[in-house]
Interface confidence: low
């Protein structure tokens, strides 16, 4: 007997051969006898099967002896064996059809689990075995599910259904709603205007919901809500927003944050979450302020840093094109007595500049500038 | 001063895999991640995705999907980057490259890996 | 896919030219862009990161300006180790993607 499987909502053709090359008689049952199509000299004509209207043959192909079986629009219990009798004998043609839909909707938040479930007709023993778009290959029978999705788990899920030898391939959109950044750092030095990004790792037509930025200073003992907003189709309008500091927000996708100027009181982190509407959960993204101040008192030449920086990164002052005068891997730094020059406050990671501030050490009869 | 230290030169056979490593010596294996670019003759760069050595997670440039694995041995501080079903088009140099994460650069590369692909 | 399109793709020069690149983003990448040299048979070597900021020992002469989507490598005045050539990267967003290149040759 052979075996033919069909996918749920597809479009499946059963063949049936006749060893004439001609149009003869013809009929389709199924396995309880009761007939689905056959033809009449060359008319279509159509039993009493839960089939009518789905049910359909080719015509133009029964001249050359071939009378197929087209079922529309298959359905899980249109799995059954179904039998062509022609020239006195029966093919038999077993269909199996089945099914595989993700358990919710397939826009999924960064962490949410995804549950694919396998629909499948009675009997049936099939196996299925899912690769995500990052390649990663997961296995199972009625149900597979994937915790933890992360961002490259966006995209297309190729599914492979195996049973008596054949398989049948399902390919199933999944959007991982996440920001493109879990986090950022932004380096500034103080009075500079600071930009924060936030952009979104997806595209929807419509995207509604509400969002807000928390902010943890270092200096503060506890964080605070610097600005509320709601996202109407991908429009942006601001709900409530602190007085200090005075951020201004972008009105359009992606979110987007200025600061008017860095201030060592604004350095730390913080946390901006974002709430879609019908779906549960949050989107976070969080963002880092460090901020560096170089500063001459009297015979004192201090340099500074504020904010979350690792404990790797080097903060230095030098002279400009001279070897660093003082470089350690702390907060601040300062040189006593600095002799007259551009001095550079450099922050760095290896070698790399992360954020730098000069200052001019004039001759000791006068006062400082700051470029 | 970190160093990327590649493994020797490679010739395949169409349809086989090559698995190349990169040694990280001289620094933090963990902080950063590692990425791989790839080079073929006469051709620019192209990315085909990176590596977290602290955590395992990985992110392949979607040309690479399902053909491309990266894994890492934190304990003797290697990263390593597989590419399976090889076609002649896969003849280029492959490199690994310090990756400071996204919004940054590469700034220390590994000395390159011919991978010659032919039957 | 961010494409960033790299012009020219060669150029000829001589020794103490002032030489300009440029790279052009398919979007805003805000200041997400750095700029490599490679020389034959050698890795690249990070010149330009965050679109202007100087490479720790990479001489003064090469300078990076631009942010969204337009962006140069200058070069004030040639020398006969700049003979290269020369890729703009953007880090903006993964996939990370490199321009086509600049091959630097001696006029």
């Known amino acids: 007997k052979k075996v033919v499987l069909g996918k749920k909502g597809d479009t499946v053709e059963l063949t049936c051969t006749a060893s004439q090359k001609k149009s003869i008689q013809f009929h389709w049952k199924n396995s309880n006898q009761i007939k689905i199509l056959g033809n009449q000299g060359s008319f279509l004509t159509k039993g009493p099967s839960k089939l009518n209207d789905r049910a359909d043959s080719r015509r133009s192909l029964w001249d050359q002896g071939n009378f197929p079986l087209i079922i529309k629009n298959l359905k899980i219990e249109d799995s059954d064996t179904y039998i062509c009798e022609v020239e006195d004998q029966k093919e038999e043609v077993q269909l199996l059809v089945f099914g595989l839909t993700a358990n919710s909707d397939t826009h999924l938040l960064q962490g949410q689990s995804l549950t694919l479930t396998l629909e499948s007709p009675p009997g049936s023993s099939p196996s299925v075995q899912c690769r995500s778009p990052r390649g990663k290959n997961i296995q199972g029978g009625k149900t597979l599910s994937v915790s933890q999705l992360e961002l490259q788990d966006s995209g297309t899920w190729t599914c492979t259904v195996l049973q008596n030898q054949k398989k049948v391939e399902f390919k199933i959109d999944i959007v991982v709603l996440a920001f493109q950044k879990a986090s950022s750092i932004v380096y500034k030095k103080e009075g500079e205007q600071v930009e924060f990004s936030f952009p979104l790792a997806f595209t929807v037509e419509k995207l509604t919901g509400s969002g807000e930025l928390w902010w943890q200073a270092e200096r503060a003992s506890s964080s605070k809500s610097w600005i509320t907003f709601d996202l109407k189709n991908k429009e942006v309008s601001v709900k409530r927003v602190t007085q200090d500091p005075k951020l201004q927000m972008g009105k359009k996708l992606p979110l987007h944050l200025t600061l008017p100027q860095a201030l060592p009181q604004y350095a730390g982190s913080g946390n901006l979450t974002l709430a879609l509407e019908a779906k549960t959960g949050k989107l976070h993204q969080e963002v880092n302020l460090v901020v560096m101040r170089a500063t001459q008192l009297q015979k004192n030449l201090t340099c500074e840093v504020w904010g979350p920086t690792s404990p790797k990164l080097m903060l230095s002052l030098k002279l400009e094109n001279k070897e660093a005068k003082v470089s350690k891997r702390e907060k601040a730094v300062w040189v006593l007595n600095p002799e007259a020059g551009m001095w550079q406050c450099l922050l760095s990671d290896s070698g790399q500049v992360l954020l730098e501030s000069n200052i001019k050490v004039l001759p000791t009869w006068s006062t400082p500038v700051q470029p | 001063q970190v160093q990327l230290v590649q493994s020797g030169a490679e010739v395949k056979k169409p349809g086989a895999s090559v698995k190349v490593s990169c040694k990280a010596s001289g620094g933090t294996f963990s902080s950063y991640a590692i990425s791989w670019v790839r080079q073929a003759p006469g051709q620019g760069l192209e990315w085909m995705g990176r590596i977290n050595p602290n955590s395992g997670n990985t992110g392949y440039a979607q040309k690479f999907q399902g053909r491309v694995t990266m894994t890492r041995d934190t304990s003797t501080s290697t990263v390593y980057m597989e590419l399976s079903s090889l076609r002649s088009e896969d003849t280029a140099v492959y490199y690994c490259?310090?990756?400071?994460?996204?919004?940054?650069?590469?700034?220390?590369w590994g000395q390159g890996t011919t991978v010659t692909v032919s039957s | 896919d961010i494409q960033m399109t790299q012009s020219p793709s060669s150029l000829s020069a001589s020794v103490g030219d002032r030489v300009t690149i440029t790279c052009r983003a398919s979007q805003s990448i805000r200041t997400y862009l750095n700029w490599y040299q490679q020389k034959p048979g050698k890795a690249p070597k990070l010149l330009i990161y965050a679109a202007s900021t100087l490479q720790s020992g990479v001489p003064s002469r090469f300078s990076g300006s631009g942010s969204g989507t337009d962006f140069t490598l200058t070069i004030s005045s040639l020398q006969p180790e700049d003979f290269a050539t020369y890729y703009c990267q953007q880090s903006y967003s993964a996939p990370l993607t490199f321009g086509g290149g600049t091959k630097l040759e001696i006029k």
């Open positions: 490259a310090r990756d400071i994460g996204e919004g940054y650069s590469m700034d220390v």
